[in-house]
Interface confidence: medium
């Protein structure tokens, strides 16, 4: 059956054959109506990418560089299976590049120039593509020949491979730039030897080199890593210190109709059948005919790759940045220490008005991206098409999952001017109720939810949390008999009571009308039992506070607080009568852009922040009528972290066991595809 | 009711130029930071240029040394000089005043733009 068939391209006679063999040998273990395989043969990687592409092809395994190709238009392939190595309990399928210094040197990432460096060899991934690729930028003009201008960046270094009669600086650390073992500073093992020996300063190696050649932890305690942000850390810490994560081998498939879970239903009966250890007729991973023949030899198994990770997401940011550089040579002519204008991420279409206007008033210090969900603004910051965004804590968990670091804290209580300098405890996630009902804590099974949004900290993390841990299962959506909780899935009770309008129906982000803390508030006025929200949002919109018309004639009180004890209480008494306390939300960006985003902010928040009085007629940031555009309408201000500058320490310890333990049920795809 | 109408869009040449103009009234138009937003055929509603009531001005690269835009506060009318047109910027042009109390969709009809030769 063609449409069950998975045709697999190989670049070599020898490729073929084993091709030939895999298809066989899968015919003999899978039934007749299961995937097969079929063999193209074509002349390079490449060629395998563009028959890909045309349809000609559906699967092939590709080193990092080349999955950067494979994705670039008009190729747009994906990854969707990637190859593991190491135990199948701790799977790994990505190295990291680092940069190993000795402890007692005194230089940063940013005061490499005139030093000594070693490296692995020449157009080798973590000793010369990513490492020059990320200072490319920093190398002195003309930057062709690119080894010329490396020579002229170190004083002296080892490059095994280069051509040291035309660049004799890189070879001066070892003559000749043998390119095999005979050179005792040739691949991981001599670059590290390189610098061990006092030859050079650095080296450029994989994050793994240290451990395999240094099994004294009191010897390794001598080196350091540099950080891209001009810091250094210990060499174990290589997961929050390294130049770029490097995807080690990938099974790549089109974006669209790519047949991915075909290849991996194939894959995975592979690994079953024919994997480590498994048949004597038929290895996958390993071949009489040569080395690394469709997959490594080295490999132990496949994992799928998650459906949320493209390959922007699967590469990274900085390894993306690296390559292009290489390829394209092409540097900012603003000097690299300034701050180029921020791109804000805008949810939908009112938060993008919103932020278009906030261009203009910044004199274009701030730029505009838009995303219709949280998670879609969240990976466009991490793969740089823009560069921060305000979150809920519950996205600030994701967000730190996926490598980005909170900026700047939203402050709600704290009056100007101490206000950027102080660290609020947080709001309180709670449960509202009308007053007429005779609803408690426990007895809400049964009843109609309305929730912020799924994965917000009030809206969801919070009550469902409590939830979890009282019914033990996931199934929120049968506890409740109908909600409102956008971003759920579509067919969903839990987007039942949702208002669209449709196509918008139960979408995270402003056109559904019941999305948010006003929302969730709107959905249990005209519709359901409980609603889901902070503390001040009964207040903000009753009273005539919120001038809409399905508003403005609620009073405050006619509705109630549920507390955890079983008792109600006014809303005029959150601190007695609360599910917890939450995180306020933040600002988040790249560690590399962080420290322009803080800056950036601050000024804004001087000229557009809550000292402006008169909102009709100058622009506010913190102002959109009860809508929280871009920032909660209640900000005082932006306040800055101190030392509470990664997401677990903003978050807190309880807040985050909580939201690890929700983790069992998580819908968030790119939670999953950033924890691959 | 906020109204906004815009005009003088048309046919014109490659590297022509047109001046469009958009009428508001019943809007704050004095006090409010005004833009130019465009819709090319197919395509989703793009930022073009914003103007705040002080008269600073930003715009979106591509159209950057070649649009101006300028307001008339005494006549309610905002403007957009567009120099140098390209067959790219064929499009719907609507302008749009968005104070910061407005996030409702205040749009007029716009008005065709057409670079063709």
């Known amino acids: 059956v063609p449409e069950k068939s998975v045709r697999w391209c190989a670049v070599s006679e020898h490729e073929a054959t084993k091709c030939q063999s895999f298809r066989d040998h899968m015919k003999s273990v899978l039934p007749s109506n299961g995937p097969s395989v079929a063999c193209v043969k074509k002349a390079s990687h490449l060629d395998c990418i563009r028959a890909i592409a045309a349809n000609e092809a559906d699967a092939v395994t590709l080193d990092a560089g080349l999955v950067y190709d494979a994705y670039l238009a008009p190729n747009n392939l994906k990854p969707v299976v990637a190859e593991f190595y190491g135990s199948k309990e701790d799977p790994q399928t990505f190295y990291y590049a680092v940069a190993v210094v000795k402890k007692d040197s005194d230089f940063q990432m940013n005061q490499l120039r005139g030093r000594k460096s070693c490296h692995t060899g020449l157009g080798r991934s973590a000793g010369w593509n990513i490492p020059i690729g990320l200072l490319y930028c920093d190398l002195p003009e003309p930057r062709k020949p690119l080894e010329k201008a490396v020579a002229n960046f170190f004083s002296g270094s080892c490059v095994p491979c280069a051509d040291g009669t035309d660049f004799p600086q890189l070879c001066q650390l070892c003559p000749g730039c043998g390119c095999s073992t005979l050179n005792q500073y040739f691949s991981y093992s001599g670059a590290f030897k390189c610098l061990k020996d006092g030859a050079g300063d650095v080296a450029f190696v994989k994050h793994s080199t240290i451990f395999e050649n240094l099994a004294n932890k009191a010897d390794r305690d001598q080196y350091e890593l540099l950080c891209l942000d001009n810091t250094r850390k210990s060499v174990d810490e290589y997961k929050d210190c390294h130049l770029a994560r490097v995807p080690s081998h990938t099974v790549v498939a089109r974006s669209v109709g790519g047949k991915e879970d075909l290849i991996w239903e194939l894959l995975n009966q592979a690994q079953e059948h024919f994997g480590k250890d498994k048949s004597k007729e038929f290895q996958l991973f390993s071949s009489p005919h040569g080395k690394d023949l469709l997959f490594k030899d080295s490999a132990h198994g496949f994992l799928k790759v998650p459906p949320r990770m493209d390959a922007k997401m699967y590469l990274g940011y900085e390894y993306i940045t690296a390559i292009r550089n290489l390829r394209e040579g092409t540097c900012p002519e603003a000097p690299t220490d300034e701050c180029k204008p921020v791109k804000w991420c805008a949810l939908s279409h009112h938060e993008r008005l919103k932020c278009d206007e906030w261009s203009v008033n910044s004199a274009g210090k701030i730029e505009c991206e838009s995303a219709e969900t949280t998670e879609d603004c969240i990976a466009k910051i991490m793969n740089g098409e823009a560069d921060a965004m305000s979150l809920d804590g519950g996205f600030v968990y994701i967000a730190g999952m996926c490598g980005l670091v909170p900026v700047l804290a939203e402050n709600y209580n704290t009056p100007n001017p101490n206000c950027e300098n102080t660290a609020e405890e947080g709001y309180f996630a709670v449960a509202v109720v009308k007053s007429s009902s005779d609803l408690t804590w426990d007895n809400l099974k049964g009843k109609k939810s309305c929730h912020t949004a799924v994965g917000r900290t009030a809206g969801w993390n919070i009550p469902m949390g409590l939830l979890y841990s009282k019914i033990n299962h996931c199934r929120f959506d049968e506890f409740f008999s109908e909600g409102c909780a956008p971003g759920s899935e579509k067919n969903s009770s839990l987007c039942k009571l949702c208002m669209g309008p449709s196509p918008n129906l139960c979408e995270p982000n402003n056109k559904e009308g019941y999305y948010g803390y006003t929302g969730a508030f709107r959905c249990l006025v005209e519709k359901g039992d409980v609603a889901f929200v902070k503390h001040q949002t009964v207040p903000q919109n009753t009273g005539g506070k919120n001038p809409d018309a399905w508003a403005k004639n609620l009073k405050e009180e006619d509705y109630e607080l549920l507390c955890l004890d079983g008792s109600r209480k006014s809303v005029q008494e959150p601190a007695n009568c609360h599910l917890a306390r939450a995180p306020n939300h933040a600002v988040v960006a790249r560690k590399d852009k962080a420290d322009c985003v803080q800056t950036l902010l601050l000024d804004q928040q001087r000229m557009f922040g809550s000292s402006v009085t008169d909102c009709s007629s100058n622009f506010c940031l913190f102002e959109s009528k009860t809508k929280d555009l871009l920032f909660r309408d209640d900000t005082v201000c932006l306040a800055k972290l101190h030392d509470r500058n990664t997401y677990e320490k903003y978050l807190g310890e309880e807040y985050v066991k909580a939201v690890t333990n929700l983790r069992k049920c998580s819908t968030s795809p790119l939670l999953e595809a950033c924890t691959f | 009711e906020v109204q906004l109408v815009e005009s003088g869009g048309g046919l014109v040449q490659p590297g022509g130029s047109l001046r469009l103009s958009c009428a508001a009234s019943?809007?704050?138009?004095?006090?409010?930071?005004m833009a130019w937003y465009r819709q090319a055929p197919g395509k989703g509603l793009e930022w073009v240029s914003g103007?705040?009531?002080?008269?600073?001005?930003n715009y979106r690269d591509s159209v950057k040394g070649r649009f101006t835009i300028s307001r008339d506060n005494s006549k309610n009318t905002l403007y957009l000089q567009m120099n140098s047109l390209r067959a790219e910027d064929t499009a719907v042009y609507y302008c749009?005043?968005?104070?910061?109390?407005?996030?409702?969709?205040?749009w007029g009809q716009g008005t065709l733009v057409t670079v063709s030769s």
């Open positions: 749009t005043d968005y104070s910061s109390r407005y996030y409702h969709d205040y």
């Open positions: 019943g809007s704050i138009f004095s006090i409010a930071t």
């Open positions: 103007i705040t009531r002080s008269g600073s001005t």
